[in-house]
């Protein structure tokens, strides 16, 4: 038996006797893009669609975190027949479209990268007008941001039994190795990754007992560099510390 199907959204007039190919989109994105903090990165995304010579209104969207539901970081819209995709959203002004959606290219440039940008990004395109269709990549592209270590906090805090302890927190990617040095210390405590802070780039090391006055130095190192910071412990009246 013969079936004739007119499906406006799939823009298809199709006579089928048994089975027919499904009208499907396809998106091509790399698994990962790597770039250094402070630099720019390009997130490539190209697509194919089943609609011949689509010239109607379209919207290009990038979102972060998770497909279909993550927050949008970039959005632009092109009017019928136009090759100019007018930016409607660019988070912090750091995202801009490099590709031409009319030529099936949604590639995005991200400026002034920070470690917080290290996540997965998903491209999406929407057709409107005569053809009403859309597609979003499920896999997305992982943006891997690398950075030399930076010590973001070093402090001396009260500890048990009138003692003091020191904390050093650093960020970097790859996650830095931390070491303490100071009076009567060899190479100090092990670094403990922080619990649930930031995007997994924070590492904290604790020196549980500062037994001597003097200078205590925290050193952070990864394959991209090293950083150090110091605190000074002086005990007055047996109870307080100045740093």
């Amino acid at each position: 038996f013969v079936r004739t199907k007119i499906d406006t959204t799939e823009n298809l007039l199709n006579t089928e006797v048994h089975s027919s190919p499904v009208q499907r989109w396809s998106m091509q994105v790399p698994a990962e893009v790597s770039a250094a903090a402070g630099d720019a990165a390009v997130l490539p995304c190209t697509f194919t669609h089943p609609h011949r010579h689509y010239d109607g209104p379209l919207t290009a969207i990038w979102r972060a975190g998770e497909p279909y539901a993550g927050p949008q970081v970039f959005r632009c819209a092109a009017a019928r027949g136009s090759e100019l995709c007018q930016t409607a959203l660019s988070l912090h002004g750091r995202f801009r479209l490099l590709g031409n959606p009319r030529r099936n290219d949604l590639s995005l440039r991200v400026e002034r990268l920070a470690l917080a940008d290290d996540r997965r990004y998903f491209c999406r395109v929407e057709f409107a007008g005569d053809v009403h269709d859309r597609y979003e990549s499920r896999h997305g592209v992982r943006l891997h941001v690398t950075a030399a270590p930076r010590i973001i906090n070093i402090s001396v805090l009260p500890g048990p039994a009138h003692a003091f302890r020191a904390l050093c927190t650093t960020e970097g990617e790859p996650p830095p190795a931390l070491a303490w040095s100071g009076p009567a210390l060899g190479n100090g405590s092990a670094a403990v990754p922080s619990s649930g802070q930031g995007h997994g780039h924070l590492v904290t090391a604790e020196l549980p007992a500062l037994n001597h006055d003097g200078r205590y130095t925290c050193t952070a190192a990864n394959s991209l560099g090293r950083s150090e910071a110091s605190v000074y412990l002086f005990r007055f009246h047996g109870a307080s510390a100045s740093t």
């Epitope: 499906d7 959204t9 089975s19 027919s20 190919p21 499904v22 499907r24 396809s26 009403h132 979003e136």
Partner: antibody
Amino acid sequence: DVQLQESGPGLVKPSQSLSLTCTVTGYSITSDFAWNWIRQFPGNKLEWMGYIRFSGSTTYKPTLKSRISITRDTSKNQFFLQLNSVTTEDSATYYCAREDYDGLFDYWGQGTTLTVTS
Amino acid sequence: DVLMTQTPLSLPVSLGDHASISCRSSQTILHSNGNTYLDWYLQKPGQSPKLLIYKVSNRFSGVPDRFSGSGSGTDFTLKISRVEAEDLGVYYCFQGSHVPYTFGGGTKLEIK
């Protein structure tokens, strides 16, 4: 979280029409995707019946085309299956499922059992 | 229609064993866009099917890495590297490259 829930009569007489409802929560059926009906016969054979897309267009299994209709109520975020002229061969567990762009069913209802008997 | 044929119908295993299920399509399910829309589902008694693998070899979110899919053209395989009790049930392959979409007849994974 996305949830789908089928509801229907349970029993239908031969030659009558069957109407099933799928209520979707946690996601708008007009936002994205295709919303499918799939049935499972006694003995476990699964059969895809058809879908309604976010846009409202439908695609049906050719052998069911003469008696199937899938529609929706966007205000209630529901979509429906109507199957006409049922026979005992239509006795099955009926599932609704969300199909994403890569042709996969990522969310299913728990199923509703339909028996066609006189 | 594209006929999906699964073998074996029943697969008795011991916990910790490897398991392999085959699925063959009656025509190629390579889509013209370069993708192959071949998925695997597991249905446990009294439950709806749950997605394991999509587009031949991609594990769905939350699916343990002991599940893997492979194949091309008309021949596809699902492998379970170390069977656990929670893996028991009926496995179905599914093609979404051609209308009508079609499922395999199912393979029951059960304890030996």
